[in-house]
């Protein structure tokens, strides 16, 4: 099985304890990790951090000691907008441009492949997205041909029917992709004005429409029927929360929220909580399960988080397992307990870790 | 109301080839998946296939998916069946049906009936 | 391709009485499965969707239940429109796959 882990570089920035650099990261954890995230400057791919070079360097010397492991670069994200990557996915020259200009740098700065992060093509951007991602993988047999190594190219998709539907032509784009990471996350936010898992596995005995499509088991499944194989798709688990602030005493799925969590102590993001910040959350809170979904949330004060621990975790693992998929995905290394100092376990990457044991069990 | 009214059915010889048609009414034709199901006389349902608004994809039983072709016309508001190389097992009632989106198919017609025979 | 066993093929019963019908799937399907009622003549009509959802209009005394490989159906308390055929569907994996269907006769 595949293990994708994502490690993004504005961890860096991180205060204290919370700040993640490559070099921190456990070179046998993964099969893949990818760098979250490149730019697009001029139509060519570039850098975005000031210092990415050089934790291109520190990321990619991890596979000396592990030559299995493979790191991609991903490009795009939430900072970089859609309309962006629409004006050059949309227009022939511009594509061309960027397509060339992706082999040079990822050979230069030792990767291995390409994830496509394009936070959400429109409903006019669909076939500018599968032609992008044909051209792409096209590019990349044809920069193998000298006898190297054939890049590899990835994408990372939007788990939300209606985005599947509106984005992506599923059958086609998984012809030309290598692995397909589906954001199994994020379903549920403060914009819903309930509290609400982000992340369930199954579908929760209350949910009518559309809630009875915002969980991992109706993505996946949606995915699979799109014509995605089963082989090529990942499934995406998070190592971070959802948070909210509760409008009155209900404090179950449901209840009333006045806005999103007040912000971690590192991550200093409203509504979001890395897993080592849950963990210390954790003390004096209580959890529960929601049992039907297979996953906790855990209650203190007026604060509510949703999040996945390492029996939700299995689960999931067993879940892609009886599916057949290709394996998981992790967003992200950075937002687990990277240094084993807050959950109390000793041990580093206690999320992930879980996740590749599962994988590994029989 | 949702109205699906299928067509075309009739005998054919084996070897043969029919094209089913199923009109549908009462919805926004183009936002839904559609399916093929038929059931041979006084034996089960039988899923054929289906295809999604877009026809971007087209899922079969892989036994029928080399003698059959499904398709569509969302502006005729018209979901078809191409039948080919027929044979006496494939005499049967053919329903289509509307999938919601829990993948159930909650609409039927009320199915055209094919019998193959010389 | 994901067999389904519908068991029994047929059964008799009296008005009033409960009645269960079990599927089997050959694999996990989790809760995607499907009840169907088919009445003589008539194309089907979906009863019950993901295992345990009542699809629109269906009266109460149908119910579903039962995750994985095994599930059940059950009606509580039979009236004479209800002895006809049942067909459960596993939409777990394509193709889609029916089981063979029950009859349900009067005593």
């Known amino acids: 099985y595949k293990l994708v882990c994502y490690y993004t570089s504005w961890s860096q920035y991180r205060e204290g304890d919370g700040s993640c650099f490559p070099d921190a990261l456990d070179r046998f954890l993964c099969t893949h990790i990818i760098y979250s995230f490149a730019n697009i400057s001029n139509d060519h791919i570039d850098t975005w951090e000031w210092n990415d070079v050089t934790l291109y360097g520190m990321l990619n010397t991890l596979k000396n000691r592990n030559p299995n492991l493979k790191t991609l670069l991903s490009v795009g994200g939430w900072n970089f907008g859609s309309q962006r990557f629409s004006k050059i996915a949309s227009n022939t020259q511009s594509r061309r441009t960027f397509i060339k200009s992706v082999p040079p740098f990822l050979r230069t700065h030792g990767f291995d492949g390409l994830d496509l992060a394009w936070l959400y093509p429109g409903r006019r951007d669909k076939q500018h997205f599968t032609t992008l991602i044909k051209e792409m993988k096209a590019e990349f047999i044809k920069e193998a041909q000298p006898g190297k190594k054939q890049l590899l190219l990835s994408a990372a998709l939007s788990a939300g029917k209606v985005t599947i539907d509106s984005s992506y032509d599923i059958a086609k784009i998984s012809q030309h992709l290598d692995f397909i990471s589906i954001m199994t996350y994020d379903f549920h936010g403060a914009w819903r004005g309930t509290t609400g898992h982000h992340s369930p596995l199954f579908r929760g005995q209350e949910d009518a429409s559309p809630d009875r499509f915002s969980n991992t088991d109706y993505a996946v499944g949606y995915m699979l029927r799109l014509g995605a194989p089963a082989s090529k798709l990942v499934m995406g688990i998070p190592t971070f929360g959802r948070s909210f602030t509760l409008a009155s005493s209900e404090t179950g799925v449901g209840a009333p929220i006045s806005g999103p969590g007040i912000p971690g102590r590192f991550t200093k993001e409203a509504g979001t909580l890395a897993y080592y910040e849950i963990c210390d959350f954790l003390r004096g809170a209580t959890v529960h399960r929601i049992l039907g979904q297979q996953v906790p949330y855990a209650t203190k004060g007026n604060q509510w988080v949703g999040y996945d621990d390492q029996e939700s975790v299995k689960s999931k693992v067993q879940y892609l397992k009886d599916r057949q998929l290709a394996g998981a995905m992790v967003w992200a290394l950075d937002l687990d307990d990277f240094q084993g100092s807050f959950c109390g376990q000793d041990l580093r990457f206690p999320l992930t870790n879980a996740i590749k044991d599962a994988l590994a069990a029989t | 109301e949702v109205k699906l009214l299928e067509s075309g059915g009739g005998l054919v010889q084996p070897g043969g080839s029919l094209k089913l048609s199923c009109a549908a009414s009462?919805?926004?034709?183009?936002?839904?998946?559609m399916s093929w199901v038929r059931q041979a006389p006084g034996k089960g349902l039988e899923w054929i296939g289906e295809?999604?608004?877009?026809?971007?994809?087209?899922n079969y039983t892989p036994s029928l998916k080399d003698k059959f072709i499904i398709s569509r016309d969302n502006a005729k508001n018209t979901l078809y069946l191409q039948m080919s190389k027929v044979r006496s097992e494939d005499t049967a009632l053919y329903y289509c049906a509307r999938p919601e989106d829990h993948f159930a198919m909650d609409y039927w017609g009320q199915g055209t009936s094919v019998t193959v025979s010389s | 391709d994901i067999q389904m066993t519908q068991s029994p093929a047929s059964q008799s019963a009296s008005l009033g009485e409960s009645v269960t019908i079990t599927c089997l799937a050959s694999?996990?399907?989790?809760?995607?499965l499907a009840w169907y009622q088919q009445k003589p003549g008539k194309s089907p009509q979906l009863l019950i969707y993901?295992?345990?959802s009542l699809a629109d209009g269906v009266p109460s005394r149908f119910s579903g239940s039962g995750s994985g490989t095994k599930f059940s159906f059950k009606i509580s308390s039979l009236q004479a429109e209800d002895f006809v055929s049942y067909y459960c569907q596993q939409l777990y994996s394509t193709p889609w796959t029916f089981g063979g269907g029950t009859k349900l006769e009067i005593k």
């Open positions: 993901a295992a345990t």
């Open positions: 295809i999604n608004p877009d026809s971007s994809t087209i």
């Open positions: 009462g919805c926004d034709f183009s936002r839904y998946w």
């Open positions: 694999q996990t399907i989790g809760t995607w």
